[in-house]
């Protein structure tokens, strides 16, 4: 069986996927869909997944959703907001992805791979 991917490699691959999305974005990402914002500095992967999983029918972020799923230790389903402490603010998916990218780059530099 294939050996598990090291967390650092998995994070690097997720960052590369987000770079790909932001660089290749022509039309509004996911038709300008809005997702819940996050005000957490911990539990980033599950929180991001809980927000993005509510976007359906957007092929551009499907790979990101799958990759985030690999980082989150618990099962996440649409409509679940355990990590989102404040649910009164929505932002565009494109902005969310952009923000997630800059943040994950920071985590990578700091050696926080999980």
């Amino acid at each position: 069986s294939p050996s598990p991917v090291p967390p650092s490699t998995a994070l690097k691959e997720l960052i590369e996927e987000l770079v790909n999305i932001t660089q290749n974005q022509k039309a509004p990402l996911c038709n300008g869909s809005m997702v819940w914002s996050i005000n957490l500095t911990a539990g980033v992967y599950c929180a991001a997944l809980e927000s993005l999983i509510n976007v359906s029918g957007c092929s551009a972020i499907e790979k990101t959703q799958r990759m985030l799923n690999g980082f989150c230790p618990h099962k996440v389903s649409a409509g679940q907001f355990s990590s989102l402490r404040v649910r009164d603010t929505k932002i565009e998916v494109a902005q969310f992805v952009k923000d997630l990218l800059v943040h994950l780059k920071k985590l990578f530099r700091e050696g926080q791979f999980n």
Epitope: S37, I38, N39, L40, T41, V44, I91, Q95, F96, K98, D99, L100, V102, H103, K105, K106
Partner: nanobody, 118 residues
Framework: GVQLLESGGGLVQPGGSLRLSCAAS????????MGWVRQAPGKGLEWVSS????????YYADSVKGRFTISRDNSKNTLYLQMNSLRAEDTAVYYC???????????WGQGTLVTVSS
């Protein structure tokens, strides 16, 4: 879209105090390093202070060190600047801004005017 809205500026006497606030919206504030920049009348932009995304690391220009304190409340999406022992030379428009090295991540507020005068 992204918005940074400063408040708390005004007229204060030398030696007085003010607390500036910056309310952020339209982006994930908690994931960004943030800072304050000022522009005195007829002068260029001057970096004042910055804070990392977690709020654990703070940095100050020598001109304000020991007098100004930067802080943030990620639960409220708000950045603060506590200004004590104000001097005439602190008179400026104070801008709240993201403090990221990455190109394309520069977000700025409209600024709030601080006037220190007797």
């Amino acid at each position: 879209g992204v918005q940074l809205l400063e408040s708390g500026g005004g007229l204060v006497q030398p030696g007085g105090s003010l607390r500036l606030s910056c309310a952020a919206s339209g982006f994930i504030f908690a994931w960004y390093d943030m800072g304050w920049v000022r522009q005195a009348p007829g002068k260029g932009l001057e970096w004042v202070s910055s804070i990392d995304w977690k709020g654990g690391k703070t940095y100050y220009a020598d001109s304000v060190k020991g007098r100004f304190t930067i802080s943030r409340d990620n639960s409220k999406n708000t950045l603060y600047l506590q200004m004590n022992s104000l001097r005439a030379e602190d008179t400026a428009v104070y801008y709240c801004a993201t403090a990221e090295d990455e190109p394309g991540y520069d977000y700025w507020g409209q600024g709030t005017l601080v006037t220190v005068s007797s």
